[in-house]
């Protein structure tokens, strides 16, 4: 891939806006410049670059100076104030006010069980292979293959609880040293970000929404890639995560405490348990070497069960094999010894969609899959849209004072370390980390929350994680809760660690940069924000996955050189834009590089070319798949889900109509009306107040 | 009352064969396991072969392994020992003894009166 | 195999006497350990079964205790008709093995 994403005139000043450079603020590209030049050569053209076909929105007749693109959107409001009101008004918007109050809660609710459902999806699609990672007996000499694990076994079963509570159990039945889970558990943490990634892709319509959306996600994943980065080295080298949760375990006489309490299962387990229910304990059993579990489905089907615990008399080849030396005898013929056996009285099957189907696991996980991503979309959309009609004019202002206001001088410092706890406290609460940072994504995308602001948001969540975490490792029985309590707890040092790396100092808040650099990016390219998922996600932790599976000695050959290269061009990219005199002409900028190791540019031709068939059968039967046709094909009247296919073709032949970019429109809900996705609202009927 | 007779001793040269019967009373005899146990002139016990109480798995000690064979039958409460190629060492008192029921720790309960086996040239 | 070692090999005691004999398991057998009586020129008669348990019928002077690999048999107060040869016997583990005796004589 690219060293930098399009880097063809790279340039010593820093504010010079480059796609894609993390570290600026970038302001609006030239576009003279941009068009009249091609890409291999400097000299100027004075041909016109025509736009291309899979640009979202034609952006002709654009002025010449845009706003910064990573300003919020001023949410004008559209509607009569409320002074201006007679009572009947008055009335009717109180009620319309709670109609959408009413809507907004119960499409967060289907929300969040469809969160819920994805979990559970993809645990049945990928949960057996997900336990049979943890079999691998190298995770105890490889730290970077425990890290790996963590990270494929998470995004596997979409939950970070499950892949800590296996590794729990395996630490419980010293099949893993605390040691060879910490890397499991640093894997895991980063695993679980991809949750609100995933729900930043819905988001993919409006390209300066999704540019702050899957910013705001992506600085989740950052946060936890550097800080992985940095730490597991650190522990490696120092174990300090083992050596200071060890002493604080063996420091307390802890008792076995309550369980955490599950506040928001407990409204949304009465609505998924209906969908499917899982035995999560097949997972765990094929991670323990459970021959017989790889059979057993996840699916639940009993849910009332009755166990009988009975000693039978069984023979033995020798006394070895005996249960305990008391409970071993002979009766002249044959060694004999008591065993436990647990008889199960199957009593009433669950009340789930699929109990009585016996598909595959496969098959339900691929249904509830499609489904549960179907119904996210769709609430996501609908929830946008509900919080874009409310959140305008005053409402809004208030809302986005609160929420992105620091405190006065001298303690506006102390804001940032506010939001973290109150993304350790909403976390706590809603008991997951994806629900509370995937319900944050579309606030940051409609421009309610800056990325500033759920930066400290979502430290707070994934230290909210952990605090449930130790909960739970307090309430675990007494074999399990010396093994779980200590992973529980270098699960937060972690957390901890990584906040005094990446936060504090505002120079230090990388990730910030790192976000709103892969956010210019895929807003631009769109492609490249699920190219980036699958690269991070899966293709780098498998090839790890894969090489130290051939052999430490595999790892090193192909690792070193690749990071060697990385550091290379870091070092490059720093010097470029810092003080490029101290380098040679040549490496001043990247045109010595061909083009497609310096530019987007040639991989979106091949991009296009892949996804061109589907411009022309790009047909949207609703604005769930609009989103899905977006994404593949970037074309650009497909948001308008209208006759798609007509319009497409239409919109090939020729575009002569002079449409602003939607980043120059102050409200959101105004720019999709004039590229006529909506239609214009009455302003009488338009009403923010609740 | 328990009873055990044992029957079937008496001399015979070295490679010899010989078959001890026990008839069993006063007690269902298909219920328990029964024990052949040896004791040579002067000497302590040896136990020798077990066999379940329905017949399908016998043991024998390493000593005699291959040359005994043990066998019941229920429906005439009768518990025998084929022994073949006799050897000097196998000379001694045979007892057959009843044991507890199936998968109870062997402790022989009941003995018979025994029947003196002899080997020489 | 499990070496079954008593001791002594014979002893000497008057009536009324307290009377202990040994047994000695080369590996622990838990309390499967049975006591056997023998007559001269009589079939052996069982006593004490699992360690402890006295068999029916069996005067209750005969105590049998320990577990492992050590144990005894008392009897507490020796009468005429307790001279005789005592085995002990494992019932832990295939092959059975018996104790050589321990011959009780009259002083």
């Known amino acids: 891939m690219a060293p930098w994403p399009e880097l063809g005139d790279a340039q010593p000043n820093p504010d010079k806006y480059l796609e894609g450079a993390a570290g600026q603020q970038p302001t609006a590209p030239d576009k003279s410049k941009e068009t009249n030049k091609t890409d291999n050569t400097e000299a100027p053209v004075t041909k016109i670059e025509l736009l291309p076909s899979y640009s979202t929105a034609t952006l002709i007749d654009e002025p010449t100076e845009v706003d910064d693109p990573w300003n919020l959107p001023t949410l004008q409001d559209s509607g009569i104030k409320w002074s201006e009101r007679d009572t009947k008004g008055k009335i009717l918007c109180f009620f319309q006010g709670i109609g959408r109050l009413i809507l907004l809660l119960g499409f967060l609710y289907f929300f969040v069980c469809s969160l819920d459902i994805l979990s559970s999806a993809f645990q049945l699609v990928g949960g057996k292979m997900a336990g049979q990672f943890f079999s691998n007996s190298s995770i105890m000499s490889n730290p970077l293959l425990g890290l790996v694990i963590g990270v494929l076994v998470t995004v596997l079963v979409q939950s970070s609880s499950t892949s800590t509570s296996i590794v729990v159990s395996m630490v419980s039945s010293s099949l893993l040293t605390v040691r060879a889970a910490i890397p499991i558990i640093m894997g895991a943490n980063i695993g679980t970000s991809i949750t609100n990634t995933i729900v930043a892709l819905m988001q993919v319509g409006d390209r300066s929404e999704f540019r702050r959306a899957f910013a705001g996600a992506t600085v989740h994943d950052f946060f936890n890639w550097l800080s992985v980065l940095v730490l597991l080295p650190v522990e490696v080298a120092t174990h300090y995560l083992e050596i200071i949760t060890q002493l604080i375990v063996e420091s307390f006489h802890f008792k076995n405490g309550e369980d955490a309490p599950d506040l928001l299962k407990v409204i949304t387990k009465p609505f998924t348990k209906l969908i499917v229910q899982l035995d999560k304990k097949v997972i765990s059993q094929i991670a323990m070497n459970d021959e017989k579990a790889k059979n057993k489905s996840l699916v639940k089907i009993w849910c009332k069960t009755f166990t009988n615990k009975t000693q039978i008399n069984v023979t033995v080849p020798s006394t070895a094999n005996c249960t305990s030396p008391s409970l071993c005898w002979t009766d002249g013929i044959q060694n004999w010894t008591m065993k436990n056996v647990t008889y199960k009285e199957n009593i009433a099957k669950c009340q789930h969609i699929f109990v009585n189907f016996h598909l595959p696991d496969l098959a339900v996980g691929t249904i509830l899959l499609i489904l549960s991503l179907l119904v996210l979309c769709g609430c996501l959309i609908m929830i946008v849209k509900i919080l874009g009609s409310v959140l305008k004019g005053q409402v809004a202002t208030v809302i986005k004072k609160t929420i992105n206001t620091d405190f006065p001088f001298p303690f506006a410092w102390l804001t940032g370390y506010l939001a973290i706890l109150v993304g350790a406290g909403m976390t706590f609460i809603v008991q997951s980390s994806s629900v509370f940072t995937s319900a944050l994504t579309p606030l940051i995308g409609i421009g309610v929350i800056t990325i500033e602001r759920a930066y400290p948001l979502t430290l707070g969540s994934n230290i909210g994680t952990t605090t449930t975490a130790i909960l739970a490792a307090l309430a675990s029985p007494g074999n399990a809760l010396r093994s779980s309590l200590q992973i529980a707890l270098c699960h937060f040092f972690f957390n901890i660690s990584g906040i005094l790396l990446w936060y504090p100092i505002p120079f230090t808040r990388l990730p910030i940069r790192m976000a709103k650099g892969l956010g210019n990016i895929s807003a631009k390219y769109r492609w490249f924000a699920v190219f980036y998922l699958i690269i991070f996600f899966f293709l780098i932790p498998l090839t790890v996955f894969g090489l130290s599976l051939a052999g430490w000695r595999v790892l090193v050959g192909v690792g070193v050189p690749v990071v060697f290269i990385i550091i290379l061009v870091l070092c490059l990219r720093l010097l470029q834009s810092r003080c490029p005199r101290v380098l040679p002409k040549k490496l001043q900028n990247w045109n010595f590089l061909p083009l497609w190791m310096r530019s987007l540019k040639p991989w979106d031709a091949v991009v296009s070319k892949f996804t061109g068939c589907f411009q022309m059968r790009c047909c949207c039967c609703c604005r769930v798949c609009c989103r899905a046709c977006c994404l593949l094909c970037d074309c650009p009247k497909c948001c308008r889900c209208s006759k798609c296919c007509e319009d497409l073709e239409e919109a090939q032949e020729g575009q002569d109509v002079p449409v602003k970019a939607p980043e120059t429109f102050d409200n959101i809900t105004i720019s999709r009306e004039a590229q006529g996705e909506v239609p214009a609202s009455d302003s009488k009927t338009e009403c923010t107040a609740l | 009352e328990v009873q055990l007779v044992e029957s079937g001793g008496g001399w015979v040269q070295p490679g010899g064969s010989l078959r001890l019967s026990c008839a069993a009373s006063g007690f269902t005899f298909s219920s328990h396991i029964m024990y052949w146990v040896r004791q040579a002139p002067g000497k302590g016990l040896e136990y020798v072969s077990g066999i379940s109480s329905n017949g399908l798995s016998s043991y024998y000690v390493d000593s005699v392994k291959g040359r005994f064979t043990i066998s019941r039958d229920n429906s005439k409460n009768l518990l025998y020992v084929h022994m073949g190629s006799l050897k000097p060492e196998d000379m001694a008192m045979y007892y057959c003894?009843?044991?507890?029921?199936?998968?109870?720790?062997?402790?022989?309960?009941?003995w018979g009166q025994g029947t003196l086996v002899t080997v020489s040239s | 195999d499990i070496q079954m070692t008593q001791s002594p090999s014979s002893l000497s005691a008057s009536i009324g006497d307290r009377v202990t004999i040994t047994c000695r398991a080369s590996?622990?057998?838990?309390?499967?350990l049975n006591w056997y009586q023998q007559k001269p020129g009589k079939a052996p008669k069982v006593l004490i079964y699992?360690?402890?348990s006295l068999q029916s019928g069996v005067p209750s002077r005969f105590i049998g205790s320990g577990s492992g690999t050590d144990f005894t048999l008392t009897i507490s107060s020796l009468q005429p008709e307790d001279f005789a040869t005592y085995y002990c016997q494992q019932s832990y583990s295939v092959p059975i093995t018996f104790g050589q005796g321990t011959r009780l004589e009259i002083k």
């Open positions: 590996q622990s057998i838990g309390t499967f």
């Open positions: 699992v360690a402890s």
């Open positions: 003894a009843r044991g507890g029921r199936d998968r109870v720790p062997a402790v022989f309960d009941y």
